[in-house]
Interface confidence: low
């Protein structure tokens, strides 16, 4: 007879898997011993391998649910073309039977006691139910038995009382506008909304419960710009060290506008970021020396000659100066203390002279006295002899300038009865008073 041929046999379940097709003979299907076959769809699956016993099935349930019974299990000879041990043909079942006991004793029914009293009504107002109970103990059931029927029964009850109405909140109202236009100020901006206990209102007779919770709530406003923060001065910093090593100096303290830093357009700190103080080292400052003005030139002389006056003989003369005022390790005066030059002496020499042009007008004298006048002069100016202007004193030292020195005796023709000086005087006009400018300011 033709069979259904499968490519697999599942040992654990005994099922055929992977249908190859139908209408073939057992012999053709079992050319591959890994295959399996069924004589009809849903029928027993037999593997093509040589026959052997399947695994034992699980034990069937015990034949009774209480006291001692028995239970069966089986195995099957599965395979083709041969026999299982014991010369059993494929498809044959082998059985095992054993004693079993699910529960030692069998349940026995119990009996009810009488009904107990009715419990109070389930509600304190309007209509409800009331209940009474009985016990399963006349007699008590045995071995898991029970009493037939219900352990409690209920009936309607009426309290004859009107029920109170408890309050419930209506929906929240809208949020109020923000209490400020910016955040971060002394009062954080908030918006508030409220609701009414009116959905429904609590009854007064009998009194209903008020609504639970709050009638309003607040929250902070979001999306607002930050409030301007005015700057505040931090503490004064340390006093800077005295910048001088002697005498008086000036020290400084600084502070920063960061307590707080101005923010969001707030104003900067008012006032100064620095303040100064006088500091005193109590150490006198060094005073550098300063040259006095040069002294007079010494007479123009030449060593080993008694006089060179009125002669074309160069001499030498010197002048000195003093370094004054140096104190407290101040600098010494720079430069030479003595100055030497070459000279021709015209001291008391009679020289031909000529009258000079008028000098410029001098200052008004006396400046603060009565009737000040100014003067100008013409002088009898000597004509200096044409001596060489330079000399070479020592070989290799180059040319040295030679200067005329001394007060000659110039000789001019008389002018307005004068031989040396002609003077002209004029009064000064519109003379202002001498006043101390400091006193004038006061």
């Amino acid at each position: 007879d033709p069979v259904l041929c499968f490519t697999q046999y599942e040992e654990s379940s005994g099922k055929c898997k992977g249908l190859l097709g139908g209408g073939v003979s057992v012999e053709d299907c079992c050319l591959n011993t890994a295959f399996a076959y069924q004589k009809r769809s849903g029928g027993l699956c037999q593997p093509c391998r040589s026959p052997r016993w399947s695994l034992w099935s699980t034990w069937a349930p015990c034949s009774v649910t209480c006291s001692e019974g028995s239970q069966l299990r089986y195995r099957r000879c599965v395979g083709w073309n041969g026999q299982c041990s014991g010369k059993v043909a494929p498809g044959t079942l082998e059985w095992q039977l054993q004693a079993c006991e699910d529960q030692q004793c069998c349940p026995e029914m119990g009996g009810w006691s009488g009904w107990g009293p009715w419990e109070p009504c389930s509600v304190t107002c309007s209509k409800g139910t009331r209940t009474r109970r009985r016990a399963c103990n006349h007699p008590a059931p045995k071995c898991g038995g029970h009493c037939p029927g219900q352990a409690q029964e209920s009936e309607a009850c009426d309290t004859q009382q009107v029920c109170p109405t408890h309050g419930a909140w209506a929906t929240w109202g809208p949020w109020t506008p923000c209490s400020a236009s910016c955040h971060g100020g002394p009062h954080e901006p908030k918006e508030t909304r409220s609701r009414k206990c009116s959905a429904p209102e609590p009854s007064q007779k009998p009194p209903g419960k008020p609504c639970p919770g709050l009638a309003y709530e607040q929250r902070r406003c979001t999306g607002l710009p930050p409030c301007p923060v005015a700057g505040g001065w931090g503490p004064w910093g340390p006093v800077s060290p005295c910048p001088v090593t002697c005498g008086l100096g000036q020290t400084m303290e600084q502070r920063t506008c960061n307590h707080p830093v101005p923010q969001h357009g707030g104003p900067f700190c008012a006032g100064d970021a620095t303040r100064t103080h006088i500091c005193n080292t109590a150490v006198p400052c060094p005073v550098d020396g300063e040259w006095d003005s040069w002294g007079e030139w010494s007479p123009c002389i030449r060593r080993n000659m008694k006089s060179i006056s009125c002669q074309e003989i160069p001499g030498q003369q010197s002048r000195g100066r003093t370094c004054r005022g140096r104190k407290f390790d101040g600098h010494r005066c720079a430069g030479q203390q003595q100055d030497i030059r070459h000279c021709y002496s015209i001291q008391h020499c009679p020289l031909k002279g000529s009258w000079s042009e008028w000098s410029t007008w001098g200052l008004c004298m006396p400046p603060c006295g009565p009737n000040p006048t100014r003067a100008r002069q013409r002088l009898c100016t000597p004509l200096l002899p044409k001596y060489p202007p330079t000399v070479s004193m020592v070989e290799g030292q180059g040319e040295k300038n030679v200067t005329f020195w001394g007060r000659p005796l110039p000789r001019c023709e008389e002018l307005q009865g004068q031989k040396l000086v002609v003077e002209e005087k004029r009064p000064c006009l519109h003379v202002p008073a001498c006043k101390d400018p400091e006193e004038e300011e006061l």
């Epitope: 955040h183 002394p186 954080e188 709050l214 709530e217 607040q218």
Partner: nanobody, 119 residues
Framework: EVQLVESGGGLVQPGGSLRLSCAAS????????MAWVRQAPGKQRELVSE???????VYADSVKGRFTISRDNSKNTLYLQMNSLRAEDTAVYYC?????????????WGQGTLVTVSS
């Protein structure tokens, strides 16, 4: 003074979850509102969610249904459970507390915790 310390940020893949915590200390009895605020790179701070003292919650439209704010008063801690995270949730998340007393209010901020959503 109120001190706020955030934790729980990190790197997570799109669709993943994170739970941020904010531990509050100091004068916490006068806190009336707490909030989570985030700031993405180059953008302004944006309110994510807030919770009032009585438990009222508010969420930004962009996080509704994905984020849950809660607070544990016994631990003085604020939480933000973030589910179904998206790349646009990448930001520094700040914990914010609003303190209000008779003499005035103050805004307190944590140092922030970075949340990065990236595959």
């Amino acid at each position: 003074e109120v001190q706020l310390v955030e934790s729980g940020g990190g790197l997570v893949q799109p669709g993943g979850s994170l739970r941020l915590s904010c531990a509050a200390s100091g004068r916490i009895s006068s806190i009336i509102h707490m909030a989570w605020v985030r700031q993405a790179p180059g953008k302004q701070r944006e309110l994510v969610s807030e919770i009032s003292r009585v438990g009222t919650t508010v969420y930004a439209d962009s996080v509704k249904g994905r984020f849950t704010i809660s607070r544990d008063n016994s631990k003085n801690t604020l939480y933000l459970q973030m589910n179904s995270l998206r790349a646009e949730d990448t930001a520094v998340y700040y914990c914010n507390a609003l303190q209000y007393e008779k003499h005035g209010g103050a805004d307190y901020w944590g140092q922030g915790t970075l949340v990065t959503v990236s595959s």
